[in-house]
Amino acid sequence: SERCDDWGLDTMRQIQVFEDEPARIKCPLFEHFLKFNYSTAHSAGLTLIWYWTRQDRDLEEPINFRLPENRISKEKDVLWFRPTLLNDTGNYTCMLRNTTYCSKVAFPLEVVQKDSCFNSPMKLPVHKLYIEYGIQRITCPNVDGYFPSSVKPTITWYMGCYKIQNFNNVIPEGMNLSFLIALISNNGNYTCVVTYPENGRTFHLTRTLTVKVVGSPKNAVPPVIHSPNDHVVYEKEPGEELLIPCTVYFSFLMDSRNEVWWTIDGKKPDDITIDVTINESISHSRTEDETRTQILSIKKVTSEDLKRSYVCHARSAKGEVAKAAKVKQKVPAPRYTVELACGFGAT
């Protein structure tokens, strides 16, 4: 066959759908690879062809669009399952072509099973709610395009295994779930089950997401450097190991990049000839505030090193801060036989 622009297997779009539920999957060519949409392609005489490779097989097969009740169908650039079956799992390819042009991409589709409490291997999206921030809502995701606006589905919300009704601060409002005042106790998995009729049949869409309650922007502060501080003096003799921790607290901030770094005499450690190592550890609180510790280490410190300026810097979306460590050379204790004896008038 003639050459075809093959975008390969797009593993970035690992699509997971539940068994025995409708699924609509758009050809990724138009979403991520080509500069034109399906309508333009169709108007230009290009045809969209679908085929697949079953799980654990190498053979590409055409998709059977003649199944009973049109279980699998194609509509424009969308492949429809009404509903899915477990053995629909595999790699699906959509190819756009005519006599002079060809472009194709494959993507993995995994049909997963869920138990009666909606537990499954499905990767769950995470929705972050600010703690004690006032009314916040989550919306049942990825249900657009499954039924026309004239159809009024029924939506049932669950937290874990339990139907949400008469909860203190969580109120179902159709496609939305409202949290009056989000608290740590609201952390968990929330599931919406959307039930709608189509051609005399009833379909269910199950969507689960993880709610994580995080620090509120009302309480967010610039980074706080806990160490170094004024209470600790790093007093060392030449030859000893110098260890200075830089410990910084970062308030949770959505999409903030938290940074910690050391400078020595105003330069990054990489730009300095001294043998310095830096080890970093990160911990998080329940509301995703972050504490970063970078330990600066000089194995055998010299008297020159003890005269340098060691500064811990930190930056977040809330601002930048820095703090210098108090470093000094330890004055050696007097040797009794010489210095002290002289003081007593010994000769």
């Epitope: 502060v221 610039p222 004024d230 003096v233 340098r308 300026s309 500064v311 703090k323 210098a324």
Partner: antibody, heavy 117, light 113 residues
Framework: SVEESGGRLVTPGTPLTLTCTVS????????MGWVRQAPGKGLEWIGT?????STYYASWAKGRFTVSKTSTTVDLTITSPTTEDTAIYFC???????????????WGQGTLVTVSS | DVVMTQTPASVEAAVGGTVTIMCQAS??????LAWYQQKPGQPPKLLIY???SLASGVPSRFKGSGSGTEFTLTISDLESADAATYYC???????????????FGGGTEVVVK
């Protein structure tokens, strides 16, 4: 930005309040300081107020000056001016937020106070 | 209080030359030192903090060094725009605490020929 106002000619002993108006940042995040400069002389630190409203003064300035603040202004009151208090008074913001090591990264243009009978 | 002593009071150098200003603290201030530049009729401008860290936008011709009680500001490749008075400042008090405290040196006038 940081801008001082309130400087004028006053007679000795008449209290005077200088105001520093800030914009673009929150006073709850920064230490703010007052520094003065007598004509032809060097810089002299008077006092500082932190984000929570605690105040710190140079030993010579205690009792002679009061630093206070609102949500967008920092005030310096000269309680009983003398002719030695004639100077340009600068309001300045700490370089880094939340830091008690105060080195001033942002300064106003200063306001002139003249104390004369 | 920590007393900051600057030397010399005035220094003169040619364009392209190098100037060194000294600052001595009456007791150890570790690396707790900042340097400012002030031109006539203008407020001071922060050049260096924590002894050697350059403030934003300050050229690398300005270099701070020292520790404990002895500190130096070196200006190399001197430009006519560097003519100004330079001040050192610490934020440590006599107990080695920083809590909003400040103490300035007496200043050094740099004259560029």
């Amino acid at each position: 930005s940081v801008e001082e106002s309130g400087g004028r000619l006053v007679t000795p002993g008449t209290p005077l309040t200088l105001t520093c108006t800030v914009s673009g940042f929150s006073l709850s995040d920064y230490y703010m300081g007052w520094v003065r400069q007598a004509p032809g002389k060097g810089l002299e630190w008077i006092g500082t107020i932190d984000g929570g409203g605690s105040t710190y003064y140079a030993s010579w300035a205690k009792g002679r000056f009061t630093v206070s603040k609102t949500s967008t202004t920092v005030d310096l009151t000269i309680t009983s001016p003398t002719t030695e208090d004639t100077a340009i008074y600068f309001c300045a913001r700490n370089y880094y937020a939340g830091l008690s090591d105060v080195f001033f990264g942002w300064w106003g243009q200063g306001t002139l106070v003249t104390v004369s009978s | 209080d920590v007393v900051m002593t600057q030397t010399p009071a005035s220094v003169e150098a040619a364009v392209g030359g190098t100037v060194t200003i000294m600052c001595q603290a009456s007791e150890t201030i570790y690396s707790g030192l900042a340097w400012y530049q002030q031109k006539p009729g203008q407020p001071p401008k922060l050049l260096i903090y924590y002894t050697s860290s350059l403030a934003s936008g300050v050229p690398s011709r300005f270099k701070g060094s020292g520790s404990g009680t002895e500190f130096t500001l070196t200006i190399s490749d001197l430009e006519s725009a560097d003519a100004a008075t330079y001040y050192c400042q610490t934020y440590y008090d006599s107990e080695g605490r920083s809590y909003g405290y400040n103490s300035f040196g007496g200043g050094t006038e740099v004259v560029v020929k």
